[in-house]
């Protein structure tokens, strides 16, 4: 019997849960969704039982195999799937299992600045990148532009030391999950610092 | 070395079907999106489409969605491109591109592989 | 569908001169935007990202700039080896568009 597998879905997408049958006979395979039933396909692909109504036109099995390709994917789709294959050749069924995660295509993240000081010349602040609605296992990249740097900076927070006199930079979040990436407004550095510019002790958000 | 290297094109009649490979080495494909661009002849670069690196998201130009599918195998470092029901304008270098570090230009490109539609 | 518009197809220039390759967006694409050279019988090559920034290995005398629907690649000091065709590409929004493309020419 296989190991658990991890598998990613775009909501509205589709899913295909991979089965490699070889050197078995079968007779028919069944497919369970959180320990519901979800589809049983009888030998050689030649009967497909599909209990649930709302689920029919989401299930296919691809050319005539058991592999069960899951269509119109809905956040609440994610859980786990299990598939039993039931053979005569064995004695007991051989089981996959699969857990699916749905995502939801990533919307252009946000950026929001920190508390602002000025002090010497020196801009510094932190920028914040989130996405807007909380989605899940979103990865934050920053993207620090400018003739002076190109550099790449992991994590949702950018740390900035700007100084006056400086050549502007660019800073771009990137936010990807994993089914999709975007990324943010670019966010100029001289721009950012102009509203400290006129009181140089200056704190603001 | 990062490499990217398409073939299966050729001759193909109107209303036909081919299949092209990119196989990419010395990079770790499976954590990449991947693109396939075309170019008709003498004419500028058009972006098909796009997968993931699971596959568990495809986008498309949209007036190619219906005739061509994007698809990868991340076992044989494969990405593939089905073309159906191809057109004499179908006729182009077909070239599969790396994003750089995954973001949305492409600093990887195949060699391309020709296609051309006649009957 | 965000359109490129590469307004010149032929561009002539010398050895030792600047030229400017312009390309305009149909909307605001930010700086959502790639510059690419095909020299003949060959693959693009990227040159610029995020509309100004060069990509490894680019030599200085290509430089890029714009933002929102107007953008330029300057080569300054253009070289013989300069002689391809010249793609913008913008990446805002799907689908992904390139410029038809700018033909460089040397004297």
């Known amino acids: 019997s296989g190991t658990l597998k991890k598998v990613a879905g775009a909501l509205d997408g589709s899913v295909t849960f991979t089965l490699n049958i070889t050197e078995i006979k079968v007779d028919y395979v069944v497919w369970t969704f959180n320990t519901f039933f979800l589809a049983m396909v009888k030998k050689d692909g030649g009967t497909i039982i599909v209990t649930q109504n709302r689920n029919r036109e989401r299930v296919d099995f691809p050319d005539g195999g058991y592999s069960l390709k899951l269509s119109k994917l809905k956040k609440n789709d994610s859980g786990i799937y299990y598939v039993g294959i039931y053979s005569s050749s064995l004695q007991q069924p051989s089981t996959q299992e699969y857990v699916l995660h749905v995502y939801e295509h990533l919307s252009k993240p946000k950026v929001t600045m920190g508390l602002q000081s000025n002090k010497n010349g020196t801009c510094v602040t932190n920028l914040t990148c989130c996405m807007e609605h909380g989605e899940e296992d979103v990865i934050y990249t920053w993207k620090a532009l400018g003739q002076a740097a190109n550099e790449s900076h992991n994590g949702s927070i950018l740390p900035i030391s700007w100084r006056w006199g400086e050549s502007d930079m660019t800073f771009i979040c990137v936010a990807r999950n994993p089914v999709s990436r975007n990324f943010s407004s670019p966010i100029l550095a001289r721009k950012l610092c102009e509203g400290a510019a006129d009181d140089p002790d200056s704190s603001m958000v | 070395e990062v490499k990217l290297l398409e073939s299966g094109g050729g001759l193909v009649q109107p209303g036909g079907s081919l299949k092209l490979s990119c196989a990419a080495s010395g990079f770790d494909f499976s954590r990449y999106w991947m693109s396939w661009v075309r170019q008709a002849p003498g004419k500028g670069l058009e972006w098909i489409g796009e997968i993931n690196p699971d596959s568990s998201t495809i986008n498309y130009t949209p007036s190619l969605k219906d005739k061509f599918i994007i698809s990868r195998d991340n076992a044989k470092n494969t990405l593939y491109l089905q073309m159906s029901k191809v057109r004499s304008e179908d006729t182009a270098l077909y070239y599969c591109?790396?994003?750089?570090?995954?973001?949305?230009?492409?600093?990887?490109w195949g060699a391309g592989t020709t296609v051309t539609v006649s009957s | 569908d965000i359109v490129m518009t590469q307004s010149h197809k032929f561009m002539s220039t010398s050895v030792g001169d600047r030229v400017s390759i312009t390309c305009k967006a149909s909307?605001?694409?930010?700086?959502?935007v790639a510059w690419y050279q095909q020299k003949p019988g060959q693959s693009p090559k990227l040159l610029i990202y995020?509309?100004?920034t060069r990509h490894t290995g680019v030599p200085d005398r290509f430089t890029g700039s714009g933002s929102g629907t107007d953008f330029t690649l300057t080569i300054s000091n253009v070289q013989s080896e300069d002689l391809a065709d010249y793609f913008c590409?913008?990446?805002?929004?799907?689908?992904?568009?390139f410029g038809g493309g700018t033909k460089l020419e040397i004297k």
């Open positions: 909307q605001d694409v930010g700086i959502a």
């Open positions: 590409q913008q990446y805002s929004s799907y689908p992904y568009t």
């Open positions: 591109a790396r994003p750089d570090g995954n973001y949305w230009y492409f600093d990887v």
């Open positions: 995020w509309a100004s």
